[in-house]
């Protein structure tokens, strides 16, 4: 058993049919010695008396808020949550496996630049009685500070019979050095509590591996005289690291016809302009990627040819 926060405790339960459970001793936080009784949740049934209560925790029915009283007065509370292990594996019931980039991916994180700021998000089908707490550091043995905000509900989607809820959190490395080579990964830890169930989820990554630039901005077309060609120009996104001479991007320019089946013409360039043939009803799209490290491409920025 360990303390998650004041008066909230997590019991680690290795569960299997007929498992004996975990013996837990609760102590009433009071100088009183006599006349103390214990109850669970809203029940008035007295579970025991004395300054300590020993319980055998076998299932969720044994978890909840234990309260010690004296003469009708509440002395203290202890909320017991369960962290369940089954077949040697800690439960992962609260969050949905996003399955990308691989199975058992519960947390996904992205950074728009090398400033040490990043966003993580996760999915759940649970709509009520749900809380999250996020901690992060760089490295684990001698951790360096990363500050995370509160997790917030960022999107709701309908998926078949189910509603799916997306939560996200923003974190900032306290002493980020954008130009430095990373040697220790960022660690992100999410505590999830649903009703009386505790679970924890972790992700470990280098900022360089989660970089996804914003799309190029100010995408413009300039027709070339007496030609079907146009000059496409764009700018680095505002959120990208500076100076651009050091934090450089490479770009992919695509001409796409109205029909998805039509052949796409693609040009790759390190410049912020390119000359392409603009077909009728086509659109021109540009996306960006770190020039020197193959992390994710940005989303496309698009303009119609006409």
């Amino acid at each position: 058993i360990w303390e998650l926060k004041k008066d909230v405790y997590v019991v680690e339960l290795d569960w299997y049919p007929d498992a004996p459970g975990e013996m837990v001793v609760l102590t009433c936080d009071t100088p009183e010695e006599d006349g103390i009784t214990w109850t669970l949740d809203q029940s008035s049934e007295v579970l025991g008396s004395g300054k300590t209560l020993t319980i055998q925790v076998k299932e969720f029915g044994d978890a909840g808020q234990y309260t010690c009283h004296k003469g009708g007065e509440v002395l203290s509370h202890s909320l017991l949550l369960l962290h369940k292990k089954e077949d040697g594996i800690w439960s992962t019931d609260i969050l949905k496996d996003q399955k990308e980039p691989k199975n058992k991916t519960f947390l996904r994180c992205e950074a728009k630049n090398y400033s040490g700021r990043f966003t993580c998000w996760w999915l759940t089908t649970i709509s009520t009685d749900l809380t999250f707490s996020v901690k992060s550091s760089r490295g684990s043995s001698d951790p360096q500070g990363v500050t995370c905000g509160a997790a917030t509900l960022s999107a709701e989607r309908v998926r078949g019979d189910n509603k799916e809820y997306e939560y996200s959190v923003e974190c900032q490395e306290d002493s980020a050095c954008p130009a430095a080579e990373e040697s220790l990964p960022i660690e992100v830890m999410v505590d999830a509590v649903h009703k009386l169930k505790y679970e924890n989820y972790t992700s470990s990554f280098f900022i360089r591996d989660i970089i996804k630039p914003d799309p190029p901005k100010n995408l413009q077309l300039k027709p070339l005289k007496n030609s079907r060609q146009v000059e496409v120009s764009w700018e680095y996104p505002d959120t990208w690291s500076t100076p651009h001479s050091y934090f450089s991007l490479t770009f992919c320019v695509q001409v796409q016809g109205k029909s998805k089946r039509e052949k796409k013409d693609r040009v790759f360039t390190d410049k912020t302009s390119a000359t392409v043939i603009c077909r009728k009803n086509a659109s021109i799209s540009v996306r960006a990627q770190d020039r020197y490290y193959s992390s994710s491409w940005s989303e496309w920025a698009s303009v119609p040819c006409s």
């Epitope: 049919p17 089954e86 089908t125 019979d161 189910n162």
Partner: nanobody, 122 residues
Framework: EVQLVESGGGVVQAGESLRLSCAAS????????MGWFRQAPGTEREFVAS???????YYPDSVKGRFTISRDNAKNTVYLQMSSLKPDDTAVYYC????????????????WGQGTQVTVSS
């Protein structure tokens, strides 16, 4: 919302068997832990069996070895196979869905059916 409808109750002789079914509709059935409870007149609702979304099962000593819970996610149905029935098993049997497994506590379940009567005569 999850809607639960029990069926299969009836009157049987002591020592006989009965299979109860519970059909679920609404939200995705496979996301829920399922349980069966029973209530005889004038008594509290009593836990009978539960099955997790990963097919682990949990029983109280009173029915262990006699009752078997199972589920078919393709049919959105949970079953309770009851054998060697005793007069003490007479009760209204309720199907329940929740998200905490294992739990024998009725308030850990979020959705309930209307119940099906089982009567075991001696």
């Amino acid at each position: 919302e999850v809607q639960l409808v029990e069926s299969g109750g009836g009157v049987v002789q002591a020592g006989e068997s009965l299979r109860l079914s519970c059909a679920a509709s609404g939200r995705t059935f496979s996301n829920y832990e399922m349980g069966w409870f029973r209530q005889a007149p004038g008594t509290e609702r009593e836990f009978v069996a539960s099955i997790s979304r990963r097919y682990s099962t949990y029983y109280p000593d009173s029915v262990k070895g006699r009752f078997t819970i199972s589920r078919d996610n393709a049919k959105n149905t949970v079953y309770l196979q009851m054998s060697s029935l005793k007069p003490d098993d007479t009760a209204v049997y309720y199907c329940a869905a929740g998200q905490l497994f294992p739990s024998s506590r009725s308030r850990d379940y979020d959705y309930w059916g209307q119940g099906t009567q089982v009567t075991v005569s001696s």
